[in-house]
């Protein structure tokens, strides 16, 4: 017997190691807390609903609750959805939480609360009240939080959730919270560091406020503090994609030289966008454990050339000095202080947005002896000239990022071109910067309603490429020609990203010759001309090749395309050639004895496989080891009969999604003896096979979502014992008969998706209603989205909660 009702519109999971029962009711359009929540629930999530109030009855009998996530049930109007505005704030009745003696974490963000709730249990360790309307913090409102360790009060007064008054914090308001470890007051228009703070703090977030001056004793007693974030106070507003007010006269955040003296345990200091012009070494006199320092978005271009403060940072692992360029200045080259050489522990150095013309070998000499350096990020700098051979000094680096520059092979270092280029270059990068929105996001650590963990999204290189080893990222530059001398001395590279350049040459197999160790090449978003079947053949160790979005020459008629270049790449495992509009090929077949995955989305197999033209039906046949083939988005409204005979013998996964297929030759699946996954989603299919097991004995996963299927055949799943996953969601299915869904097959399913269909809940549905009520098969969204379209009385009702008792009487009669 089940231990919770199927009518519960929530996902219930067990975390056995932690002994947790997790009930997740996220975004279920709830207007009240649902009945049937198991009494032994430990973690209850009710975020993104429209529950108007909480009372002592809300959690009655849920005595084991350890965490309640009740965020975003009444999001402040400027922050919330405009088509579903919440005009009555969440009401929390007295003693709603006081009986929950095990409650440790309570999230009440995004509910328009005016006050810190009272009557909280003493067990509480985490309280999150972000994105509410609380802008006055008084000592008396915090008296019950004696055991609180984590307190989030941010986003209660800022441009997206304005409060129109000044944020006030009573003196010593937090002082009695003697166990407080994490305090966040971010995005609140706070004008001064609150005093006195409890000495137990390990993390203090004061970013995006209106603090103009740090006082000498603000942090005096915080000798356990490990993270301090003061970013966005006195912000650098140039190019900010959000309302931004600098301090008076564009002055920097004022920080006394001894402000950090007590912070002997500090590991992370973030001073992003504080309009700093200098970094006094004295700040770091006592902070010798600092591991991460963010100084991005300041005015430190000159300081980078002096940077004596770096001598005091022997433990520093990450340093970010990005976007510190002087306005309207295009420097000839980069001036790095010799002090960088003292950063013996440094692993990650980011200097984007310094804005300079030529990267010279000696510019990087202070970094040569940094044995631990792994990531050097010089992206978005408008570098025009760079001799890549200089990176032979940096073989130990995992990532050299030169993306979003203007590097081109024609660079002539004699042409300095300061004045003529400076203005246009600096201005021209504004839209590119907005694209990335890491350095230019208002709050890069903001949480959405859906996830309660901070989402520090750091754009980095393509992860799948990075894992192969040393990576050089030259994406989004102005390279229009590559030659082997460009890569001289770079034989150590494992991954090269050339995506988003202007390369239009006919590659002949010589261009990348020095790159003997290269495993991954991203050549997407260029203008590849596949005239020669020898293209890329010099890359003897290449395992992954991405030539997606190179449609330029494929869109023109009469051009030679040698798609059989694959035969010369002896260890190629994965080839991506998506969105190329390929509609012709000079070679009739692609060949490879190593390729396992081919992505061929967004091409024109409808043209290559035109009715009556059999020349290309064997296009993929000689990819002898191919296991995955994605030919979705190829405008295939039908498949010619020879297509499956021409498929490679070891194919396991085949995707034909988004093709507009109106019919499918199910019987032809017999040709694919090893097929395990077939994705036919987002087509216009109206039928399923008579008997799936007659078409395939190997198929484990069948995805038919978003089609036009109205009914299932009588013996659809008869004997389909190997099937584990079946997705029939978003179709027009009205009825499911018992014979279509035999129990001995369904019981093997791990997942069955039936939501968003058009079930008719007449007496003919009695078996189906009975079955969904009793089956152990996981059916996502069963309580909420497996619903009836009729008849009248049952319209919109959940199938699971149907009462067809009268039909059962008819049956027994």
């Amino acid at each position: 017997a089940r231990w919770f009702p199927k009518t519960l519109p929530c996902d219930v999971t067990l975390d056995v190691p932690k002994n947790h029962v997790i009930v997740d009711c996220t975004d279920k359009h709830l207007t009240e807390i649902p009945g049937g929540i198991p009494t032994n629930t430990t973690n209850l999530t009710l975020t993104i609903n429209h529950i108007p109030d909480i009372s002592p009855a809300s959690f009655h009998r849920l005595d084991h609750l350890v965490e309640i996530d009740f965020r975003c049930n009444c999001v402040p109007i400027p922050l919330g959805s405009k088509n579903n505005m919440c005009i009555k704030r969440l009401q929390i009745k007295p003693r709603s939480f006081s009986g929950l003696t095990y409650l440790k974490s309570l999230y009440l963000d995004g509910n328009q609360l005016l006050e810190i709730p009272q009557g909280l249990p003493p067990s509480l360790q985490l309280l999150s009240l972000e994105a509410n309307n609380i802008f006055s913090i008084r000592k008396e409102n915090l008296t019950e939080l004696a055991n609180i360790e984590i307190l989030y009060l941010g986003q209660n007064c800022y441009y997206r959730n304005p409060c129109y008054v000044s944020y006030s914090i009573e003196k010593d308001a937090f002082l009695n919270l003697t166990k407080l470890k994490v305090l966040s007051l971010k995005d609140n228009n706070v004008t001064a560091v609150p005093t006195v703070l409890p000495s137990t703090l390990t993390e203090l977030y004061l970013y995006n406020n209106m603090i103009a001056k740090i006082q000498e004793d603000d942090f005096n007693n915080l000798n356990q503090l490990q993270i301090l974030d003061l970013s966005g106070n006195c912000p650098r507003c140039y190019n900010a994609p959000f309302p931004c007010a600098p301090c008076k006269n564009n002055s920097p955040l004022q920080i006394p030289v001894n402000a950090f003296d007590a912070l002997t345990e500090l590991k992370v200091l973030r001073l992003h966008s504080n309009s700093l012009q200098h970094v006094p070494p004295r700040w770091f006199k006592n902070i010798n454990k600092l591991q991460e320092l963010d100084l991005s978005q300041n005015f430190l271009a000159k300081e980078i050339g002096d940077a004596k403060f770096l001598h005091f940072l022997p433990s520093l692992i990450q340093l970010d000095l990005s976007f510190n360029f002087e306005l309207q200045v295009y420097r000839a080259s980069m001036n790095l202080s010799q002090a960088f050489s003292s950063l013996k522990s440094l692993k990650i150095l980011r200097i984007r947005g310094y804005v300079f013309k030529e990267l010279k070998s000696f510019n990087l000499s202070p970094l040569h002896n940094l044995q631990n350096l792994e990531v050097l990020d010089l992206g978005t700098n408008f570098i025009k000239i760079a001799n890549l051979s200089m990176f032979k000094q940096f073989k130990r680096l995992k990532v050299i990022d030169l993306s979003v520059n203007k590097i081109s092979p024609s660079g002539d270092s004699s042409e300095v071109g300061f004045c003529s280029n400076a203005r246009t270059s600096v201005e021209s990068y504004e839209p590119q910067v907005l694209e990335q929105l890491h350095y230019f996001r208002y709050d890069k650590y903001a949480r959405s309603c859906r996830f309660k963990n901070k989402e520090a999204s750091f754009m980095s290189v393509n992860e799948s490429c990075y894992k192969y080893g040393q990576t050089l990222d030259l994406s989004k530059n102005s390279i229009f020609f590559v030659k082997s001398s460009d890569f001289q001395h770079l034989s150590f590279l494992k991954c090269l990203n050339l995506s988003g350049n202007l390369i239009s040459q006919t590659l002949n197999g010589s261009e990348f010759q020095p790159l003997a160790e290269l495993r991954y090449l991203d050549f997407s978003n260029n203008r590849l001309d596949l005239l020669h079947s020898t293209a890329f053949e010099e890359l003897h160790k290449l395992e992954v090749l991405d030539i997606s979005s190179n449609s330029h020459y494929f869109q023109s008629e009469g051009i030679t395309h040698m798609l059989n270049f694959t035969k010369n790449l002896k260890v190629l495992q994965k080839l991506m050639m998506n969105d190329n509009d390929i509609s012709s090929s000079t070679s009739r077949t692609m060949e490879s004895e190593s390729l396992r995955t081919l992505e061929f989305r967004g091409n024109h197999l409808d043209v290559l496989w035109r009715e009556g033209d059999n020349r290309y039906l064997q296009l993929f046949k000689n990819l002898l080891k191919l296991e995955e083939l994605d030919i979705s988005k190829n405008s295939l409204s039908f498949l010619p009969s020879g297509v499956f005979d021409g498929m490679p013998p070891n194919l396991k996964n085949l995707s034909l999604a988004k093709n507009g297929l109106k019919s499918f030759s199910w019987k032809k699946l017999q040709c694919l003896k090893n097929l395990e996954t077939l994705d036919l989603s987002h087509n216009q299919l109206t039928t399923v096979p008579e008997r799936l097991s007659n078409c395939s004995r190997s198929l484990k996963n069948l995805i038919l979502k978003n089609n036009q299927i109205r009914s299932l055949t009588k013996y659809f799943l008869q004997d389909a014992f190997q099937l584990r996953y079946l997705d029939l969601s978003s179709n027009k299915i009205q009825m499911i008969q018992k014979t279509s869904f035999p129990e001995n097959v369904l019981n093997n399913l791990k997942m069955l998706l039936l939501h968003h269909n058009r079930f008719l809940c007449t007496c003919d549905a009695v078996w189906f209603v009975w079955w969904v009520n009793h089956t152990e098969v996981t059916i996502p969204y069963l309580a909420t989205d497996v619903t009836c379209v009729g008849p009248g009385a049952h319209k919109g009702q959940s199938v699971i909660s149907l009462d067809l008792y009268t039909c059962e009487l008819d049956l027994t009669n």
Epitope: Q215, D217, I255, V257, P280, R282, K285, H311
Partner: antibody
Amino acid sequence: DVQLQESGPGLVKPSDTLSLTCTVTGYSITSDYAWNWIRQPPGNKLEWIGHISYRGNTNYNPSLKSRVTISRDTSKNQFSLKLSSVTAADTAVYYCASWNYYGYVDYAMDYWGQGTTVTVSS
Amino acid sequence: DIQMTQSPSSLSASVGDRVTITCRASQDISNYLNWYQQKPGKAVKLLIYYTSRLHSGVPSRFSGSGSGTDYTLTISSLQPEDFATYFCQQGDTFPTFGQGTKVEIK
């Protein structure tokens, strides 16, 4: 511009308490800065005595700590030095000076008074 | 205490001369070294802070250098108004001063 002016008795008896006042004009002593006392005995090096910060926090030279008190009167924009149990060795020119907390480095005294001579003698 | 030793204690020079004064600390002071100018009856003036940074309004003929324990003040071309006493001061711990160097007219 910031200006500092020392004042106080030029003669103090041994074992008495030396009291000096520094009047600051052109800047509020509660806005910024650490306000220092420094002395120079005849033919000798300058010696830092101590300071009071714009927040009222004090810091003293360890060798004089037991005898020194620095205080302030914010209404008059003044800060004062008291040095108890004086001896002839405390005879010196006494200077007040400011140090910008929000500058680049510790104890770079950017504004000085002209100094006042104090003789300890009976 | 950190002891500061200045040399020479005095020197004679002419207008236009290049003058160098050195200061040695009893231990590494991490560049926390300042230089001052003192004239009789006048307020002391800050010239250079943090080894080499020129205080606002100070002429560029004054420069500072050094690291660790050894530091130097250089006047590239001595002017009449530069005849005065110069002293160094460390700010790594509580401040201590050098004994001063008197620059006199030759």
